[in-house]
């Protein structure tokens, strides 16, 4: 039995920040779980982890180069990514594992979310306004 995951197909980070919501077909309330966010088509780079259990505060881990926070809903984990760089534009996959109570469960691979990080383009003001017409 696998947990199903829904993600937005695409998100645009205009201000170098984005909220990526991972919605699960499973209620995480009073469960011990590990939710993670993976970068790249092969999910090779794990960039954020949210660990939760019934007795402790939510714990959030960010890989060096990523600034991550996490929020828990009954059937969702939202990853808040800040200070993103243009070169971090990629596809990101949500993963979930539930360890307790048994049985161990994980998810079917989701379709992922393309996060497009838009660079901040400042409008150039002309240094020289040019000759004024009489």
């Amino acid at each position: 039995n696998k947990i199903l995951v829904k993600q937005s197909p695409m998100l645009v980070a205009y201000d170098n920040a984005v909220n990526l919501s991972c919605k699960y077909s499973y209620n995480l309330f009073s469960r011990e779980f590990r939710a993670s966010l993976h970068k790249g088509l092969d999910s090779a780079v794990e960039v954020c982890v949210v660990y939760g259990n019934y007795s402790q505060q939510l714990q959030v881990y960010s890989k060096t180069g990523f600034n991550c926070d996490g929020k828990l809903g009954n059937e969702s984990v939202t990853f808040y990514l800040q200070n993103l760089y243009v070169n971090q534009t990629d596809i990101y996959f949500c993963k979930i594992e539930v360890m307790y109570p048994p049985p161990y469960l994980d998810n079917e691979k989701s379709n992922g979310t393309i996060i497009h990080v838009k660079g901040k383009h400042l409008c150039p003001s002309p240094l020289f306004p040019g000759p004024s017409k009489p």
Partner: nanobody, 124 residues
């Protein structure tokens, strides 16, 4: 809940070698990392080395690069620290740590569980 048990500490002469082991037990996820930190008397606990479950990410403190090697046996849930060319300044209590992060984190705050520590003494 994760339990960590270290072994392998002892006294050795400068230039000598030791191998530390740390066995983890409890509920494990598909990825996590384990690391070694050390604490000399009167000093802060400092990062030594770390490795993740997939063994595709390892990191070392500059002071031990080329002398120490971290490895792990996933079947035994055990991580090892091979220490060669030991120096007097390596004398410390060595602690094994466990983190739910899936990379070789050098940040002490990322580690959720700690072993009891094993003493390494390097002296002539």
């Amino acid at each position: 809940e994760v339990q960590l048990v270290e072994s392998g500490g002892g006294e050795v002469q400068p230039g000598g070698s030791l191998r530390l082991s740390c066995a983890a037990s409890g509920r494990m996820f598909s990825n996590y990392a384990m690391g070694w930190f050390r604490q000399a008397p009167g000093k802060e606990r400092e990062f030594v080395a770390a490795i993740n479950y997939r063994r595709d990410d390892a990191d070392y403190a500059e002071s031990v690069k080329g002398r120490f090697t971290i490895s792990r046996d996933n079947a035994k849930n055990t991580v090892y620290l091979e220490m060669n060319s030991l120096r007097a300044e390596d004398t410390a209590v060595y602690y094994c740590g466990f983190t739910y992060a899936g990379w070789a984190s050098s940040r002490r705050d990322d580690y959720n569980y700690w072993g009891q520590g094993t003493l390494v003494t390097v002296k002539p």
